[in-house]
Interface confidence: medium
Amino acid sequence: AMHVAQPAVVLASSRGIASFVCEYASPGKATEVRVTVLRQADSQVTEVCAATYMMGNELTFLDDSICTGTFNESRVNLTIQGLRAMDTGLYICKVELMYPPPYYLGIGNGTQIYVIDPEPCPDSD
Amino acid sequence: AMHVAQPAVVLASSRGIASFVCEYASPGKATEVRVTVLRQADSQVTEVCAATYMMGNELTFLDDSICTGTFNESRVNLTIQGLRAMDTGLYICKVELMYPPPYYLGIGNGTQIYVIDPEPCPDSD
């Protein structure tokens, strides 16, 4: 298994955007790396988003994904947007070195993302 | 020492208000209880506010205090207002049974209060 580090706590901005770094210890030079963000809340785990990084290309999530990210050697800078207070939870970074073999899997301990819904702005008269 | 319980984490509202309960295990029926909120950040501890509860009266903080609270048996409901992102930190509840003797002191493990500054509302035209 592969060691994956991520921050313990992150606060989403009042616009519902949270960013954190997911860093992994790689035993070799992978040309294909898959990054998945999982959310754990009430012992339920759901997939938030996933992307595959091919060496030389960008880290690309699906068009309708709430995640964006950049890749720099063994560091993945992740940004999750559109978060609401109800999305507060533990966000786990899962990294897979897909190719070439040997395949390695690493799962972080999770980043607790706290989200506070903003107060609505007063109507302009 | 007296056991004091308080939540591990609390999120301030987008208005900068954070509320939490500080509960203590009292070995007797005290008629005078002093409650102090301390803030720990970067290994520095500062006093945020303090109030003394006299049985039959209300829990009264100073007029210019950022704290308010109510007392119910051995539970203190504390509210801290006017918080900004820079006020994020560990807020420790300290309870002293002042009268009658014997004097008891209890200090909680602290509540991590996270504060996010709101985005400014757009100017009305």
Partner: antibody, heavy 125, light 107 residues
Amino acid sequence: QVQLKESGPGLVAPSQSLSITCTVSGFSLTSYGLSWVRQPPGKGLEWLGVIWYDGNTNFHSALISRLTISKDNSKSQVFLELNSLQTDDTATYYCAKTEGHYYGSNYGYYALDYWGQGTSVTVSS
Amino acid sequence: DIQMTQSPASLSVSVGETVTITCRASENIYSNLAWYQQKQGKSPQLLVYAATNLADGVPSRFSGSGSGTQYSLKINSLQSEDFGTYFCQHLWGTPYTFGGGTKLEIK
């Protein structure tokens, strides 16, 4: 049940090539890696190399110029070829199923979980 | 390449005793470590994978522990069938090098 069996020449002259075949049953070479390990008489184990489910190979750095590992999935056979033999290549040669993460599995650690009985090779004129 | 240093090289013990064999990696191998047992004239057999997990059919008197660069194999209440040679192997990126081995002999 998982079985592996090595077959080799027994005696090889110095400077010649060694060819050993490992025939497996009970698992598919398209799903698992297969490692080669040797053990000189009275000495410890030396990992030589591995061929993965997709035909990718990794070798011990000291043998990279002399060692070839290939396979025939349809015959469930893996082949080791070691060139330019010297007397210190005299050893028992083992093949071993290399359990662990392959694409799409759910398990994060590697091990050589099943071994053949070994084939003894003597390099001598 | 990652080097594996195993100690002691040999050990003479009696049936019923407890022994501990240690293995040190030259760098962090993140618990990607296996232990094998080899009896005279036989092929090695997997005992422990992922530093702490017992392989199928391995008696519970065997236990693995450790993390980072330091790992150990403990055998409680040694049985006569436990005598032989034990090897550790790292599996954190190739080459998957072995330790030098520990020969366990009956006193």
